[in-house]
Interface confidence: medium
């Protein structure tokens, strides 16, 4: 079957997100991918969205992330804008209202996004073939 347009949008957003480091991409988030063997795809997307929402809700106005220079400020603003877009699209793909995120494992946001990108690309290659 055809790939969902949302999936393409997610990959595009993830490509943009992983291209550029900001002051806060090294901050840690809950690593939902560490033990996701018994998790459905929809649950994974839902939990990923939850993690991203927790991150940007907490760090959107974090002055450590906003930095001191105009460039740092705008890079962080762009990061948050992309994370919100990703969150919205993941919820759409998941089709679930809520999902628990209880893992103790942590990873950097940068690694989390790279892992998510790999998963999304794998999904895309399956649905486009």
């Amino acid at each position: 079957h055809k790939c969902d347009i949302t999936l393409q949008e997610i990959i595009k957003t993830l490509n943009s997100l992983t291209e550029q480091k900001t002051l806060c991409t090294e901050l840690t988030v809950t690593d939902i991918f560490a033990a996701s063997k018994n998790t459905t795809e929809k649950e994974t997307f839902c939990r990923a969205a939850t993690v991203l929402r927790q991150f940007y809700s907490h760090h959107e106005k974090d002055t450590r992330c906003l930095g001191a220079t105009a460039q740092q400020f705008h890079r962080h603003k762009q990061l948050i804008r992309f994370l919100k877009r990703l969150d919205r699209n993941l919820w759409g793909l998941a089709g679930l209202n809520s999902c628990p995120v209880k893992e103790a494992n942590q990873s950097t946001l940068e690694n989390f996004l790279e892992r998510l990108k790999t998963i999304m690309r794998e999904k895309y290659s399956k649905c486009s073939s």
Partner: nanobody
């Protein structure tokens, strides 16, 4: 042509107040976020405060939080910065900047000197 004209700078004693204004023209002011950025003598540019297009969302650098207030009047195409409890380290040229993914247009700046 985009034009940003700052005013309101001057010499003030520590603990004093100033209100900076920035008159904007040449673009649809109400559609853009705006910022105040400063440059202290011999130092690089530092963003001070940012406000979204509607005036509802604001950001402040740690160094000015609780002392400075950014606001805007979209009917007058004007950006403001109310600066209270001024310190010597606030001495700088203050620029108003149009914000659209980066600070792409700047004014000429207004000098604020905090000294006793």
């Amino acid at each position: 042509e985009v034009q940003l004209l700052e005013s309101g700078g001057g010499l003030v004693q520590p603990g004093g107040s100033l209100r900076l204004s920035c008159a904007a023209s040449g673009f649809t002011f109400r559609n853009y976020g705006m910022a105040w950025v400063r440059q202290a003598p011999g130092k690089g540019l530092e963003w001070v405060s940012w406000i979204d297009a509607s005036g509802t969302e604001t950001y402040y650098a740690d160094s000015v939080k609780g002392r400075f207030t950014i606001s805007r009047d979209n009917s007058k195409n004007t950006l403001y910065l109310q600066m209270n409890s001024l310190r010597a380290e606030d001495t700088a040229v203050y620029y108003c900047a149009k914000s659209s993914g980066r600070f792409d247009y700047w004014g000429q700046g207004t000098l604020v000197t905090v000294s006793s």
